[in-house]
């Protein structure tokens, strides 16, 4: 009869929803355990760079304070090249005074 | 009849299976592009992680070559000055000579 | 003896990159600090610039750029990147530091024309 | 920048005449302030270091003062051969080191 008929054809609608339905529940539990290993990964990563960022910060004022301890002993060295030259010109001329003595 | 109020049941069924299936579509839709979004921002944290070592690693081997030029200064330094001293002492003692002389 | 003394002078094109050399008797550039000074003809002198004894390079400001100043054990150089005719001039080598130049070449004169 | 101002630039002085040189830097160089003297065809020689010591073998007529940005150099009795262009050459902390534009001293 019509009704057999439609009923048969409602149960394999049915059936066919019901079976999408936990195709999709499965497909979501895996896009959500996806998500979540995502976001897991993601938070590691951002500590990773926090991490990262404050040591190269570190790294960064650390050869800031190298370059002027550098700049100042390279300072430091050519105030002695002057102060070496100054002693060798009294030098000589202590020696030139002896020599006339 | 049994048969209309099956059929009704059976309606109702599929009516909230079909419900179901699209709140379950809606979810994964909106589960689906979380994770994109996850995704995508833990590839560019991921970036950002090489990029920071990178730069990282390369403030470390210039700490590590300022330090060693530091060293290396910090002897001209005390070797110029050893160096200023003898020469002080030279010209003290020429001195004295020439006063003894 | 203690001296220091200038290569010989040479005649340039302008553009054409020139090394002069400064060459040391008697004493050593590990303990002491080396300049080159400039003198056009009948003006005054110019400081171009200086190294010290490790290494440390120092130029006048007009000078940074135009001119490289590099040492090896027994010899300091002076390198013109790119002459210019305002660049003929004597070019004295000296040694010390600061304001300080006891020892110093007799000069060497360069002449950039073309 | 440093800037060394010299004067005067040219002067004439007849033999046992007092002649003073000024130099004024555009900064305080806290006495790194050396004068020379140059004669023509030579390199220049140094007098004075350290804006009043004088150098090897330079006669004690010439005399060199002054501190901060001002500095003299003074020759007291002068001879005929302190005829010669003058010099200051200044340096700062930073080692910028700048030539006064020359004194040319003439003797009468």
């Known amino acids: 009869t019509a009704n057999s008929v439609a009923c048969r054809d409602g149960l394999r609608a049915q059936a066919e929803c019901r079976n999408t339905t936990h195709l999709l529940q499965r497909q979501l539990t895996r896009t959500q355990d996806s998500l979540l290993q995502a976001e897991t990964q993601a938070n590691s990563c951002n500590l990773t760079v926090v991490t990262l960022q404050e040591s190269l910060e570190k790294k960064v004022s650390q050869a800031l304070e190298q370059q002027a301890r550098i700049k100042e002993l390279e300072n430091e060295v050519t105030k002695l090249n002057q102060e070496l030259e100054n002693l060798r010109i009294q030098k000589e001329t202590s020696s030139t005074v002896q020599v006339n003595s | 009849t049994a048969n209309s109020v099956a059929c009704r049941d059976g309606l109702r069924a599929q009516a909230e299976c079909r419900n179901t299936t699209h709140l379950l579509q809606r979810q994964l839709t909106r589960t689906q592009d979380s994770l994109l979004q996850a995704e995508t921002q833990a590839n560019s944290c991921n970036l950002t992680v090489v990029t920071l070592q990178e730069s990282l690693e390369k403030k470390v081997s210039q700490a590590l070559e300022q330090q060693a030029r530091i060293k290396e200064l910090e002897n001209e330094v005390t070797k110029l000055n050893q160096e200023l001293e003898n020469l002080r002492i030279q010209k003290e003692t020429s001195s004295t000579v020439q006063v003894n002389s | 003896a203690q001296s220091v003394k200038e290569s010989e002078g040479r005649l340039v094109t302008p553009g054409t990159p020139l090394t002069l050399t400064c060459t040391v008797s008697?004493?050593?550039?590990?303990?002491?600090?080396m300049s080159w000074v400039r003198q056009a003809p009948g003006k005054g002198l110019e400081w171009i610039g200086l190294i010290n004894s490790y290494g440390t390079t120092y130029y006048a400001s007009w000078a940074k750029g135009r001119f490289t100043i590099s040492k090896t054990s027994t010899t300091v150089e002076l390198k013109i990147t790119s002459p210019t005719t305002e660049d003929t001039a004597t070019y004295f080598c000296?040694?010390?530091?600061?304001?300080?130049?006891?020892?110093w070449g007799q000069g060497t004169l360069v002449t950039v024309s073309s | 920048e440093l800037v060394m101002t010299q004067t005067p630039s040219s002067t004439s002085t007849a033999v046992g005449d007092t002649v003073t040189i000024k130099c004024q830097a555009s900064?305080?160089?806290?006495?790194?302030l050396a004068w020379y003297q140059q004669k023509p065809g030579q390199p220049p020689k140094i007098l004075i270091y350290?804006?009043?010591n004088l150098a090897s073998g330079v006669p004690s007529r010439f005399k060199g003062s002054g501190s901060g940005t001002e500095y003299t150099l003074t020759i007291s009795g002068v001879q005929r051969e302190d005829a010669a262009t003058y010099y200051c050459l200044g340096s700062d902390s930073s080692w910028d080191t700048v030539f006064g534009g020359g004194t040319e001293l003439e003797i009468l």
């Open positions: 900064q305080s160089i806290g006495s790194n």
């Open positions: 008697g004493f050593s550039l590990s303990n002491s600090g």
């Open positions: 350290s804006a009043s």
């Open positions: 000296a040694r010390g530091a600061g304001s300080s130049y006891g020892l």
